[in-house]
Amino acid sequence: MMTGTIETTGNISAEKGGSIILQCHLSSTTAQVTQVNWEQQDQLLAICNADLGWHISPSFKDRVAPGPGLGLTLQSLTVNDTGEYFCIYHTYPDGTYTGRIFLEVLESSVAEHGARFQIP
């Protein structure tokens, strides 16, 4: 039975040209996290395997930095980066947990962090 919940940074906004940390946290479970995959719609951004380390997709290699922790730092933001991002936690023995973050990249300096929320 899957008892865990994924807490994410929720709906966030950031300035064009700036950077943002995409962060998820798995709680309420003793399951072991074996791997976290970061995806954007139909594209893989990165994989963090507990044993094998990081894989960064070539299309993001120049502007994605691993971490902090299992998170991902997205740099040199453009308006095209606006959209949904998913953290997919592969765990043993629970299985897969998925968190969603919506990022809006703004032209001006009115960017603000949204509220944190949970996905069961």
Epitope: A50, H55, S57
Partner: antibody
Framework: QVQLVQSGAEVKKPGASVKVSCKTS????????MHWVRQAPGQRLEWIGG????????SYNQKFQGRVTITVDTSASTAYMELSSLRSEDTAVYYC????????????WGQGTTVTVSS | DIQMTQSPSSMSASVGDRVTITCKAS??????VVWYQQKPGKAPKLLIY???YRYTGVPDRFSGSGSGTDFTFTISSLQPEDIATYYC?????????FGGGTKLEIK
């Protein structure tokens, strides 16, 4: 240039163990993950597992869990794969392969080591 | 484990032909797919990584595409030296798994 040189062919009896080595050169050993892949005659490639030489972290295919041990000697820039309780279906060519920096694609491979298990 | 199903398992084509090989994953693997070429008695060689990126030194007649579960590998104009077996592989989640291979022969 990058080179992965594996140990020679082995013939083993069922129930025995085999240890295959993979000596590397031409790159910084600890910066690249090392994998082991095998290919039985006429069969598809099969991933056995990998090791991160930087921290010794290993990931194994469950199919081989308990029978396989992947290790490294960082001072010798060498990786090892030991497979125990051998059976005839373990007869295969065993390859070491490194995966690139920040990339899981296996970009350089050893020449292969033939392991024959026969009574 | 994720199953990678390649088709066709073998095919013959003429020099200059456009050759297409498909690979279907049993579940979502995003763009975490690699294509290798293997010649008899030799180790595999990396051709395409992250579904569509050509590895250093690989001729531009080789290309890859796809995302999710369906992937395609194409040789735009077959050359005699392309005779080999081609494998797809996923690294979306361990254990990494390979397709059954496509053996390419010259007509």
């Amino acid at each position: 240039q990058v080179q992965l040189v594996q140990s020679g062919a082995e013939v083993k009896k069922p129930g025995a163990s085999v240890k295959v080595s993979c000596k590397t050169s031409g790159y910084t050993f600890t910066e690249y993950t090392m994998h082991w892949v095998r290919q039985a005659p006429g069969q598809r490639l099969e991933w056995i597992g990998g090791i991160n030489p930087n921290n010794g972290g290993t990931s194994y295919n469950q199919k081989f869990q308990g029978r396989v041990t992947i290790t490294v000697d960082t001072s010798a820039s060498t990786a090892y794969m030991e497979l125990s309780s051998l059976r005839s279906e373990d007869t295969a060519v065993y390859y070491c392969a490194r995966s690139g920096n920040w990339d899981y694609a296996m970009d350089y491979w050893g020449q292969g080591t033939t392991v024959t298990v026969s009574s | 484990d994720i199953q990678m199903t390649q088709s066709p398992s073998s095919m013959s084509a003429s020099v200059g032909d456009r050759v297409t090989i498909t690979c279907k994953a049993s579940q979502h693997v995003s763009t975490a797919v690699v294509w290798y070429q293997q010649k008899p008695g030799k180790a595999p060689k990396l051709l395409i990584y992250s579904a569509s990126y050509r590895y250093t030194g690989v001729p531009d007649r080789f290309s890859g595409s796809g995302s999710g579960t369906d992937f395609t590998f194409t040789i735009s104009s077959l050359q005699p030296e392309d005779i080999a077996t081609y494998y797809c592989q996923q690294h979306y989640i361990t254990p990494w798994t390979f397709g059954g291979g496509t053996k390419l022969e010259i007509k």
